[in-house]
């Protein structure tokens, strides 16, 4: 099952070109930008999605860090290099030969350098903290209802097993969703927490990546949950390496 066979589209990625040229006339979809074949029964990797999105405007932001090793995507959009599996290559460079190392969600984790910069391995982001502020409501949401609905959403829409949703914290109006996934925990076929978080982020911003589906209509016991601000923090299995100059 790679794509919707009837009209040959990719349910999980609208930034694709699909045609019935797969084996036996099956529908096959390729990501824009890279031309790589994608599995439309699951989420497309963030690297391929960023590559496809390159024409979109820059989306930079600065966040307050919850811990000394947490990373924030301050650099915004760039045209990434993806490996044959669609993952980010550990070293990314721009057209002016400026290079840097990234983690598995494509966020820079070192100072920028030149072509001599070495990035020995792709460091895994094993803990993602999604920090949301919701719009005012008549009353606070029930915490257990909110927890259940967000876990259901991540399972049904983003295909993430709820065992990777470590916790849902709530102090009105702030909601924090903790995603955790160690290398040893992630089995073949499991959605990566980085990809799930990216799809969720785009949904929250009203920029859904899904083909032909309505935007995200998030409700808790029938009450609309409208998000007015999203911050995402990334924690890697190995702490990032920035110079003191950047930290001051």
């Amino acid at each position: 099952h790679t794509a919707a066979q009837d009209n040959c589209t990719c349910p999980t990625n609208k930034m694709t070109v699909c045609s019935p040229d797969g084996p036996g006339g099956r529908c096959q979809c390729r990501a824009l930008g890279s031309g790589m074949a994608v599995d439309c029964s699951t989420l497309t990797s963030k690297c391929l999605l960023l590559k496809a999105r390159m024409s979109a405007p820059k989306n930079a932001r600065t966040l307050v860090r919850p811990s000394e090793h947490a990373l924030v995507d301050n650099d915004g959009l760039y045209d990434p290099d993806c490996d044959p599996e669609g993952r980010f290559k550990a070293r990314q460079c721009n057209q002016t030969s400026v290079c840097w190392c990234v983690n598995s969600v494509g966020v820079r984790r070192t100072d920028k350098g030149d072509l001599s910069l070495r990035c020995d391995e792709l460091v895994r982001t094993h803990h993602i903290l999604i920090d949301l502020r919701h719009r005012p409501t008549a009353g606070a949401f029930n915490h257990s209802d909110l927890d259940a609905e967000l876990r259901r959403l991540f399972r049904e829409r983003y295909r993430l097993h709820p065992k990777f949703v470590a916790a849902v914290h709530y102090e009105q109006p702030t909601i924090q969703i903790e995603l955790r996934q160690n290398t040893s925990q992630k089995a073949a076929g499991d959605v990566d927490i980085g990809d799930a978080a990216y799809y969720f982020e785009r949904d929250i911003k009203g920029e859904s990546l899904f083909q032909g589906r309505g935007g995200l209509d998030l409700r808790v016991r029938g009450e609309p949950l409208q998000v007015e601000r999203t911050l995402i923090y990334y924690l890697d299995e190995i702490p990032p390496k920035f110079s003191m100059k950047r930290l001051t």
């Epitope: 349910p11 259901r152 399972r155 049904e156 709820p162 065992k163 916790a167």
Partner: antibody, heavy 119, light 111 residues
């Protein structure tokens, strides 16, 4: 209220196929995946697989791979489970069960469909 | 596959007394403090009914004489004061890893 209503009992010959339906009501059909669980006479419960009502694809217990197919029809809020190459050991009550909200528990169950395989 | 072993296979308890059923799992079903372990009750001719989810959370509408405890690989279902309507077979189930598996069941009767 949430309801899962299954099709009636079936008697099949060895080697044949059976298709059991499960019609959902009382909630948004595509919000919850549907599992299939079977129970042989006097025996325990055995998970067969789960279908995403949102995407339409399924994940199967390896034990049944190649013999079981789960499909869904969003226009009628119905899920189907087809089991082929039936043998006497497949005689069982087949249940559909909805995922609960947060932890993959099965919170609502169909009434069950007895499938008898006999020559 | 994760193997679930319930004990005892059958249990006879007097009305009003405490009933305890155990479930041992071949590997941990704990993920960051969330235990993907659930308990079901099945009466003759009926489908199973969810009692407890996530090891210790009581499903809506289930009497509070039912409780669940445990973490990792060892779990317990307790009925604090047995009622006549509690006669049934009880199953534990893990949803941590596909294929999801059930215990063999514990038949609870009145002494």
């Amino acid at each position: 209220q949430v309801q899962l209503v299954q099709s009636g009992a079936e008697v099949k010959k060895p080697g044949a196929s059976v298709k059991v339906s499960c019609k959902a009501s009382g909630y948004t059909f595509t919000d919850y995946s549907i599992n299939w669980v079977r129970q042989a006479p006097g025996q325990g419960l055995e998970w067969m697989g789960v279908i995403s009502t949102y995407y339409g694809d399924a994940s199967y217990n390896q034990k049944f791979k190649g013999r079981v197919t789960m499909t869904r029809d969003t226009s009628t809020s119905t899920v189907y489970m087809e089991l082929s190459s039936l043998r006497s050991e497949d005689t069982a009550v087949y249940y559909c069960a909805r995922y609960g909200d947060g932890y993959n528990q099965f919170d609502y169950w169909g009434q069950g469909t007895l499938v008898t395989v006999s020559s | 596959d994760i193997v679930m072993t319930q004990s005892p296979d059958s249990l006879a308890v007097s009305l009003g007394e405490r009933a305890t059923i155990n479930c041992r799992v071949s590997e941990s079903v704990d993920s960051y403090g969330n235990n993907f372990m659930h308990w079901y009750q099945q009466k003759p001719g009926q489908p199973p009914k969810l009692l407890i989810y996530r090891a210790s959370n009581l499903e809506s509408g289930v009497p509070d004489r039912f409780s669940g405890s445990g973490s990792g690989t060892d779990f317990t279902l307790t009925i604090s004061s047995l009622q006549a309507e509690d006669v049934a077979v009880y199953y534990c189930q893990q949803s941590y890893e596909d294929p999801y598996t059930f215990g063999q069941g514990t038949k609870l009767e009145i002494k």
